[in-house]
């Protein structure tokens, strides 16, 4: 029986041009994690496999850095990478528990002050 | 065209060291894992390590972790595997292989160098 | 550690054939499975990993299926060049253990 549930830092928000840490937490089970998958809808971002080490996909090497832990640091954001991110743990011999974290990417207020106002 | 060059076949004597070189082209080298995997004659294959070229931080085989040394040198694009206190069981064809894009599988490989360990 | 079987261990097969191979896992290894082909003297080519995604070239009458602890790799319509041996491996824990192989052979 899966016991286990994932505490995730839920829906957050971050200027443009900055970073963000995604984090994931698993409690509640004494299943041993083998690995922890970090997802943005169907595209893979990252894999922390126990064994193993760290696979950051090639196509997001340059902007994503692994951890602290087994949570995901994104850099250099941009407005596109606003949506919807999942954290996969595969665990034995529960199964698989996954968390979903909601990334908005705002405008920084540089560039919004920048927008309206102009310098004499 | 993503392309790995090994270095030429090598004899040694047990209890000697072979370096075995892989240089790589065609792609962002720091960007993808390279990974050792050796083939004894006539048998299957056996996963020895994994190493970041960009970190240099490696992986390996519990089996070939008191032997094996993966290193990188990015100025030229390739990576090495020395093995340690070679044995006649170590002779094998042994291959580099780049790490997929999207898991620990292996999307493209050396075209192999064999070492052979004998007196 | 996980070990990777692989059945049959050979097989004799025509051209034309519908050839299936079968890849079982010691336990539950999800979709974390890719496919090789190895012909003598060369490197193995990657096939298929995560299961059932082709890799980038490779012919369509090559496909991957199944999840779990039990694999399958099915060449829909043999071809000359396809007779050759094939590997399973988990590729999501260390070793990353292969299986034994699959020798297709000219029947």
């Known amino acids: 029986m899966m016991t286990g549930t994932i505490e995730t830092t839920g829906n957050i928000s971050a200027e443009k041009g900055g970073s963000i840490i995604l984090q994931c937490h698993l409690s509640s089970t004494t299943a041993q994690v083998t690995q922890v998958n970090w997802e943005q809808q169907d595209q893979l971002l990252a894999i922390c496999n126990a064994d193993l080490g760290w696979h950051i996909s090639p196509s997001f090497k340059d902007r994503v850095a692994p951890g602290p832990g087994l949570g995901l640091t994104l850099q250099s954001l941009t407005v596109n990478d606003t949506g919807e991110y999942f954290c996969i743990y595969h665990t034995y011999p529960d199964g698989t528990y996954t968390g979903r974290i909601f990334l908005e990417v705002l405008e920084s207020s540089v560039a919004e002050h920048g927008a309206r106002f102009q310098i004499p | 065209e993503v392309q790995l060059v090994q270095s030429g076949a090598e004899v040694k004597k047990p209890g000697a060291s072979v370096k075995v070189s892989c240089k790589a082209s065609?792609?962002?080298?720091?960007?993808?894992?390279m990974h050792w995997v050796r083939q004894a004659p006539g048998q299957g294959l056996e996963w020895m390590g994994r190493?970041?070229?960009?970190?240099?931080?490696?992986k390996y085989n519990e089996k070939f972790k008191t032997r094996v040394t993966m290193t990188v040198d990015t100025s030229t694009s390739t990576v090495y595997m020395e093995l340690s206190s070679l044995r006649s069981e170590d002779t094998a064809v042994y291959y580099c292989?780049?790490?997929?894009?999207?898991?620990?599988?292996?999307?493209?490989w050396g075209q192999g160098t064999l070492v052979t360990v004998s007196s | 550690d996980i070990q990777m079987t692989q059945s049959p261990s050979s097989l004799s097969a025509s051209v034309g054939d519908r050839v299936t191979i079968t890849c079982r896992a010691s336990?539950?290894?999800?979709?974390?499975l890719a496919w090789y082909q190895q012909k003598p003297g060369k490197a193995p080519k990657l096939l298929i990993y995560?299961?059932?995604t082709l890799a980038e070239g490779v012919p369509s009458r090559f496909s991957g299926s199944g999840s779990g602890t039990d694999f399958t790799l099915t060449i829909s319509s043999l071809q000359p060049e396809d007779f050759a041996t094939y590997y399973c491996?988990?590729?999501?824990?260390?070793?990353?253990?292969f299986g034994g192989g699959t020798k297709v052979e000219i029947k």
């Open positions: 292989a780049r790490e997929g894009a999207y898991g620990y599988y292996f999307d493209y």
């Open positions: 065609g792609y962002t080298f720091t960007n993808y894992w």
């Open positions: 190493i970041d070229p960009d970190s240099t931080g490696s």
């Open positions: 336990e539950n290894i999800y979709s974390y």
């Open positions: 995560n299961a059932r």
């Open positions: 491996q988990y590729h999501s824990g260390s070793p990353l253990p």
